[in-house]
């Protein structure tokens, strides 16, 4: 069986996927869909997944959703907001992805791979 991917490699691959999305974005990402914002500095992967999983029918972020799923230790389903402490603010998916990218780059530099 294939050996598990090291967390650092998995994070690097997720960052590369987000770079790909932001660089290749022509039309509004996911038709300008809005997702819940996050005000957490911990539990980033599950929180991001809980927000993005509510976007359906957007092929551009499907790979990101799958990759985030690999980082989150618990099962996440649409409509679940355990990590989102404040649910009164929505932002565009494109902005969310952009923000997630800059943040994950920071985590990578700091050696926080999980």
């Amino acid at each position: 069986s294939p050996s598990p991917v090291p967390p650092s490699t998995a994070l690097k691959e997720l960052i590369e996927e987000l770079v790909n999305i932001t660089q290749n974005q022509k039309a509004p990402l996911c038709n300008g869909s809005m997702v819940w914002s996050i005000n957490l500095t911990a539990g980033v992967y599950c929180a991001a997944l809980e927000s993005l999983i509510n976007v359906s029918g957007c092929s551009a972020i499907e790979k990101t959703q799958r990759m985030l799923n690999g980082f989150c230790p618990h099962k996440v389903s649409a409509g679940q907001f355990s990590s989102l402490r404040v649910r009164d603010t929505k932002i565009e998916v494109a902005q969310f992805v952009k923000d997630l990218l800059v943040h994950l780059k920071k985590l990578f530099r700091e050696g926080q791979f999980n």
């Epitope: 996050i38 005000n39 952009k98 923000d99």
Partner: nanobody, 118 residues
């Protein structure tokens, strides 16, 4: 879209105090390093202070060190600047801004005017 809205500026006497606030919206504030920049009348932009995304690391220009304190409340999406022992030379428009090295991540507020005068 992204918005940074400063408040708390005004007229204060030398030696007085003010607390500036910056309310952020339209982006994930908690994931960004943030800072304050000022522009005195007829002068260029001057970096004042910055804070990392977690709020654990703070940095100050020598001109304000020991007098100004930067802080943030990620639960409220708000950045603060506590200004004590104000001097005439602190008179400026104070801008709240993201403090990221990455190109394309520069977000700025409209600024709030601080006037220190007797």
């Amino acid at each position: 879209g992204v918005q940074l809205l400063e408040s708390g500026g005004g007229l204060v006497q030398p030696g007085g105090s003010l607390r500036l606030s910056c309310a952020a919206s339209g982006f994930i504030f908690a994931w960004y390093d943030m800072g304050w920049v000022r522009q005195a009348p007829g002068k260029g932009l001057e970096w004042v202070s910055s804070i990392d995304w977690k709020g654990g690391k703070t940095y100050y220009a020598d001109s304000v060190k020991g007098r100004f304190t930067i802080s943030r409340d990620n639960s409220k999406n708000t950045l603060y600047l506590q200004m004590n022992s104000l001097r005439a030379e602190d008179t400026a428009v104070y801008y709240c801004a993201t403090a990221e090295d990455e190109p394309g991540y520069d977000y700025w507020g409209q600024g709030t005017l601080v006037t220190v005068s007797s």
